[in-house]
Interface confidence: low
């Protein structure tokens, strides 16, 4: 009974009552400096210790700033909208000081016919209508403005981008006699763009366009497009760069072939292929030209459309990531997995340790998870001794001001982590293993037991007795 | 016709010891999880214990850990819920509950065994 | 843990109308699509009956005249033609985490 995992998360607090926006103070500095963690990496509790005190000491002075909360805006522009035709929109917190956005994607699986998308209505109507969409969020993870939740880009213009388009952020279809429902995801992200340019993302260095899930695959779709729209309308300055949350998916054989019934248990190349035609969906153009009119689903999948993409992008993906088992029809329900399972889920990871071979900026650890950057304890897992926000600081500092990345890494400053260990949880810094169905918690000697590892031929390898590597897993989880 | 048939509640002293049972039929034991669920007189509904298919993983709630052992046996079809060190507070009407293979909710209940700890 | 918080403690309805009880929970029950989130009725001297499951599925057997919806960290239970039978307490449930706590119940009755 494994496989989905919980993290811990912040209460949620209800919205402030509505305030005036503090005018900014005059002789603010027009950019926040980098963090370099190189100097501290041994000491990070009492960095951090000094790093919050600071913050404090000054709270008095920028109130505003330390508030959590990002405010709903609806596009100005109504005509782009979500799937049932009520307004697009992005939540924004601004930090003044700083020339750095972000601009996150949200996920949600998609929909591909009228069939699946009325019962996403019926049941998921948030990812399709902005009609009961909160007044404000609060920004968790990479999205946080807190140092130690987000030692990485805490003071960043903060842009989080609701999904309500069931689209993968790819269409371009509005709302007609003809369609019951609008399909504009690609729209959406060039109509906040527009938006945000008014609202100080003129003046930006760098956008990082973000995402996870379904927001993470929006990325790769998008990021380009992006970066071509800013050239357009007379930005060619701002740096645009891609972070592909649990987006990159395989177009792999499923464990169980089904037929192609809902959103779920259709393979994921034929729901994407009914998808595109659904959609009216668009592709990088660089990706579009290198395969045949038809098929241009393939740009869906992030090993066959990174190589085409110009922007860099940093790709984060669990080896084993649970999206991609549940397209490929593995259900881990409680009862103990067969070797056939246990084989078809380390090839999994195998296939996928494959893909990002020749990514150079990726954090893959050997995990059974889902989404990382905007969990509070993003900062929790670490590949070879390198956490995700440091990975991420690393990759700034790799790409200097230019707009590629360098090929030579920094010493003492990975950007390329990839877990090499062949089984899900081999990471001791994975994420707390939870029952998939109950959310209750397993140790991951319990967990791997129950995967059907034999503890032996798991200690071997690593030249362990089976109870020394019980005794390690245990201590490390 | 699936069933789960609760005994061995009665009349405790404080400090003293009962062992619940639970017979199953109609279904094959072995492949649920089983969760016991206690409701104190007029009040509402509080998890006690949960099982695994197995036995291979086993969960207490704050208030009884320490004192009370879920077991089962499968070849008997049997859940059991040893109870020591028993408490005024650990009055209640004690329902075994099976939890659905796929969302950890109770599809099947017992009908409940009364406990009563009292002097 | 997770704190469930029922409300309305209990609600009188007139039969044939509608009665609607909300279950709010102290941090979002619902990941990857699924919302672990169960309804109960119990009634006197009986053990509690599964009504509804994850959010939103009637378990067989129930009257379709029930309901459930919400995600996150909002449900609904909604019973849109209210009959005598249906006089009991009712619970809310999550599943996503140990441990899987209730609603403190709501009671129905009848106006």
């Known amino acids: 009974s494994e496989g989905r995992k919980t993290w811990r998360r912040r209460g949620q607090q209800p919205p402030p009552p509505p305030r005036t926006e503090a005018a900014p103070a005059a002789g603010q500095p027009v950019e926040s400096f980098p963090l370099d963690f190189t100097a501290v990496e041994g000491n990070m509790d009492s960095f951090m210790a000094q790093v919050k005190s600071l913050a404090q000491s000054l709270y008095p002075c920028s109130a505003q700033q330390l508030n959590e909360d990002l405010r709903l805006h609806l596009l100005l522009n109504t005509s782009v909208t979500c799937n049932d035709g009520s307004p697009a929109g992005y939540y924004l917190k601004e930090s003044r000081g700083s020339r750095r956005w972000l601009l996150f994607l949200e996920g949600g699986w998609y929909c591909f016919n009228r069939e699946n998308c009325d019962s996403r209505y019926d049941t998921m109507r948030r990812l399709m209508s902005s009609r009961d969409w909160p007044r404000t969020r609060t920004g968790t993870g990479i999205l946080s403005s807190q140092p130690e939740e987000n030692p990485y880009w805490w003071n960043a213009n903060m842009v989080f981008i609701p999904y309500c388009s069931s689209d993968v952020w790819s269409g371009a279809s509005s709302k007609s006699e003809k369609n019951e429902y609008a399909f504009m995801g690609a729209l959406i992200i060039q109509e906040v763009v527009r938006e945000l340019l008014g609202r100080g993302l003129s003046g930006a260095k760098v956008l990082l366009l973000a995402g996870s899930s379904a927001g993470g695959t929006g990325v790769l779709l998008n990021v380009d497009r992006v970066a071509e729209q800013l050239e357009k309308l007379g930005y060619p300055a701002i740096q645009v760069r891609g972070l592909a949350d649990s987006g990159w998916f395989l177009d792999n054989k499923q464990y169980r072939h089904t037929d192609c019934v809902d959103t779920i248990t259709c393979a994921p190349t034929e729901a994407i292929r009914r998808g595109i035609r659904y959609w009216n969906g668009v592709v990088p153009e660089r990706c579009r030209r290198q395969f045949q009119e038809g098929e241009e689903w393939n740009c869906f999948f992030g090993y066959k459309v990174y190589p085409t993409l110009r922007c860099p992008v940093f790709v984060v993906q669990w080896l084993f990531d649970e999206a991609q088992l549940t397209v490929d029809n593995v259900h881990l329900t409680g009862q103990p997995v067969q070797e056939g399972l246990r084989l078809y889920i380390q090839n999994l990871g195998r296939e996928l340790r494959h893909t990002l071979k020749d990514v150079p900026a990726s954090f893959a650890p050997a995990c059974l998870s889902h989404e990382i950057i905007i969990r509070s304890h993003w900062t929790d897992v670490q590949v070879k001794g390198t956490s995700l926000p440091r990975a991420l600081h690393c990759w700034d500092r790799s790409l200097h001001d230019s707009h590629k990345a360098s090929k030579t890494p920094l010493k003492g400053c990975p950007v390329h982590l990839v877990d090499s260990c062949p089984w899900p949880h081999c990471n001791p810094s994975c994420p707390t293993v939870r029952d998939q169905f109950t959310g209750q918690e397993m140790n991951v000697a319990q967990f791997l037991m129950h995967m059907g590892f034999d503890m032996q031929t798991v200690a071997q390898p690593q030249g362990l007795e089976p109870s020394e590597l019980l005794g390690m897993l245990s201590n490390g989880s | 016709e699936v069933q789960l048939v609760e005994s061995g509640g009665g009349l405790v002293q404080p400090g003293g010891s009962l062992r619940l049972s639970c017979a199953a039929s109609g279904f094959t034991f072995s492949d649920y999880g089983m969760h016991w669920v206690r409701q104190a007189p007029g009040k509402g509904l509080e998890w006690v214990s949960y099982i695994s298919s197995g036995s291979r993983t086993v969960y207490y709630a704050d208030s009884v850990k320490g004192r009370f052992t879920i077991s089962r046996d499968n070849a008997k079809n049997s859940l059991y819920l040893q109870m020591n060190s028993l408490r005024d507070e650990d009055t209640a009407v004690y329902y075994c509950?099976?939890?659905?293979?796929?969302?950890?909710?109770?599809?099947?209940w017992g009908q409940g065994t009364l406990v009563t700890v009292s002097s | 843990d997770i704190v469930m918080t029922q409300s309305p403690d209990s609600l009188a309805v007139s039969l044939g109308e509608r009665a609607t009880i909300n279950c709010r929970a102290s941090?979002?029950?619902?990941?990857?699509?699924?919302?672990?989130m169960h309804w109960y009725q119990q009634k006197p001297g009986q053990p509690p009956k599964l009504l509804i499951y994850l959010a939103s599925n009637l378990e067989s057997g129930v009257p379709d005249r029930f309901s459930g919806s919400g995600s996150g960290t909002d449900f609904t239970l909604t019973i849109s033609s209210l009959q005598a039978e249906d006089v009991a307490v009712y619970y809310c449930q999550h599943s996503r985490e140990l441990p899987p706590t209730f609603g403190q119940g709501t009671k129905l009755e009848i106006k």
């Open positions: 941090k979002i029950v619902s990941t990857s699509g699924y919302s672990y």
């Open positions: 509950a099976r939890k659905h293979y796929n969302g950890g909710y109770f599809d099947v």
